[in-house]
């Protein structure tokens, strides 16, 4: 049975086996085509989601689709139902929390009262002044809180208490990539993790431990990427894995927050990386223990210099490392989070690519998560 499952796939009507390598190869090998059903699927980037959250205290902003202008949501008459609608528009299904925050002196958007129309937030037509003088601060999910704060050092062993959103993504029980829990159903990782194996069946997620082999595996229902362009294989290196059953959160299994749309991190901003990847370039083996390291944002211009990545780092990517080199993500860390701590931990990057590991002029390159918020929200909405 184990051998059969490992090398063959059972087609129905009529029942017969096909070699497992024929799964997800673009050819219908089973009469009903079920060999092409449970495969990595691509999902287009899609339209702009008409709500977003700002790094200014997680305040809600709403798009006026007629003009293309964004407005800040006034707290006047804002209700739990409106909060739920806003979060649902971003694809969240959990119960949101919201509160009033004072309109700040730097408020540069017009403030409008919000209403609802066919399950979408709208601006109230006859919106007068914002009488409360407050904006809506909205949290769609409790996220980004860990039991333990890491100490700032170079590279050291990590505890799952510090990083309860870190998961191991495994194919045939072998660790391939890292990933981050975003909510009970969804894990964020890199698309390139799935280039070699596009069948969903054999992929599993392991959560809740800092040791590679020691925790139960979770079944995966779907793997979703943006359409792959083989001519630019490093682009759009982002994937969402939908778990078959929702996670139960605990001290060691918790979600990390998505970044705010306007999360612009300046060079030298401190960040953290974690993973079970190689401890040295071409070092041949994964670390059994989760490792953590502090790094910093490296300016994209510097990263694109002639002695570095020569223009390959796009505006949807970011670089992080330490100026002198020596601290970096490596093979096996792919898909894991690049994290920033404000009030909560945010996944600002996904470990994507780089030349070697830890070189001074070639730091790690990460998918910039804020560039893909629309895509994430559109995927989630389609799967609600």
């Amino acid at each position: 049975k184990v051998i059969l499952d490992k090398y063959y796939f059972l087609c129905g009507q009529p029942l017969h086996f096909i070699p497992r390598k024929q799964l997800c190869d673009g050819e219908l090998d089973c009469p009903l085509g079920e060999d092409e059903e449970h495969c990595v699927k691509s999902f287009p980037e899609g339209p702009a989601v008409a709500v977003r959250l700002s790094k200014d205290r997680s305040t809600l902003q709403v798009l006026d689709s007629a003009t293309g202008n964004w407005f800040s949501a006034c707290f006047d008459n804002f209700t739990e139902a409106l909060a739920e609608t806003a979060c649902r528009q971003m694809g969240y299904s959990s119960k949101p929390t919201f509160r009033a925050v004072e309109i700040g002196p730097d408020q540069d958007l017009d403030v409008v009262e919000i209403t609802e129309n066919s399950q979408e937030l709208r601006m109230r037509n006859s919106s007068g002044p914002c009488l409360s003088g407050s904006l809506v601060s909205l949290h769609c999910l409790a996220c980004g809180k860990s039991l333990k704060t890491p100490r700032v050092v170079g590279v050291e062993e990590a505890s799952v208490d510090s990083w309860p959103w870190q998961v191991s993504i495994q194919y045939d029980k072998q660790h391939v990539c890292g990933g981050s829990i975003l909510d009970p159903h969804w894990v964020l990782t890199a698309a390139h993790c799935f280039r070699k194996h596009t069948d969903v069946f054999n992929w599993k997620v392991r959560a809740g431990s800092d040791k590679l082999g020691s925790f139960p595996s979770l079944a995966v229902a779907k793997i979703i990427i943006i359409e792959f362009n083989p001519m630019y294989p490093k682009d759009n290196d982002i994937a969402l894995m939908k778990l078959q059953f929702p996670l139960t959160f605990s001290g060691t299994v918790r979600p990390i927050c998505l970044p705010f749309f306007d999360e612009e991190l300046t060079p030298a901003t401190p960040l953290w990386i974690i993973g079970w990847g190689f401890t040295k370039q071409n070092g041949g083996k994964m670390s059994d223990i989760l490792l953590q390291a502090s790094v910093q944002v490296i300016d994209s211009t510097r990263c694109n210099a002639d002695d570095a990545y020569q223009g390959e780092v796009t505006e949807k990517m970011m670089c992080a490392g330490i100026p002198e080199g020596g601290v970096d993500t490596c093979q096996g860390d792919s898909g894991g989070p690049l994290m920033y701590q404000s009030d909560q931990w945010h996944v600002v990057g996904i470990v994507s690519w780089g030349y070697g590991c830890g070189g001074p002029s070639t730091p790690g390159v990460y998918t910039k998560v804020s560039a893909y918020l629309n895509w994430i929200y559109n995927v989630w909405k389609a799967e609600l």
Epitope: P230, M231, Y232, E312
Partner: antibody, heavy 115, light 107 residues
Amino acid sequence: QVQLVQSGAEVKKPGSSVKVSCKASGYTFTDYYMHWVRQAPGQGLEWMGGIIPIFGTANYAQKFQGRVTITADESTSTAYMELSSLRSEDTAVYYCAKEGANGYWGQGTLVTVSS
Amino acid sequence: DIQMTQSPSSLSASVGDRVTITCQASQDISNYLNWYQQKPGKAPKLLIYKASSLESGVPSRFSGSGSGTDFTLTISSLQPEDFATYYCQQSSRIPPTFGQGTKVEIK
């Protein structure tokens, strides 16, 4: 810096095959898409196919499907393009080209098909 | 396949002129557009990749713009060495396709 060095000119008989090589240096050969493009005398550029060595799978233009084979040898950082069942209208300069930033083209290989 | 329509097919200009060449894709290609320069008997040379990124070593008088379906290559002040044929190429989808070329000649 990036360099693509192609094999020399070839004169071939109709019905035969030609294999053009393209040796890459100055970048990570496996990670970038390599195109094969041809240009008939006085004409524009025509894409034939391409490959990304790390994934090993080649793509081909419909027009050349079944007649062209593109391969890559990671150990020597060399890409190959083989065109079979040659006819006189295949007389052209054949180029390999790296996609993206530092997108560089080989110097070209003239293939003349004549009886 | 995505069609790339380049215009004009040829133009005459003088040294110092500002020259604009346009390229239109038959469907949305985001910013996956390259511009090449080719001189007689030579291989094409990349000028602009991803619609607006200037290739290393290319003079700053060359610039590219556009996104979606409409793209432009601009030479701000034409130099003697710029007389050549220019091609656009989409690399959004397989098969990548080229425009038919724009020949820039001396007036």
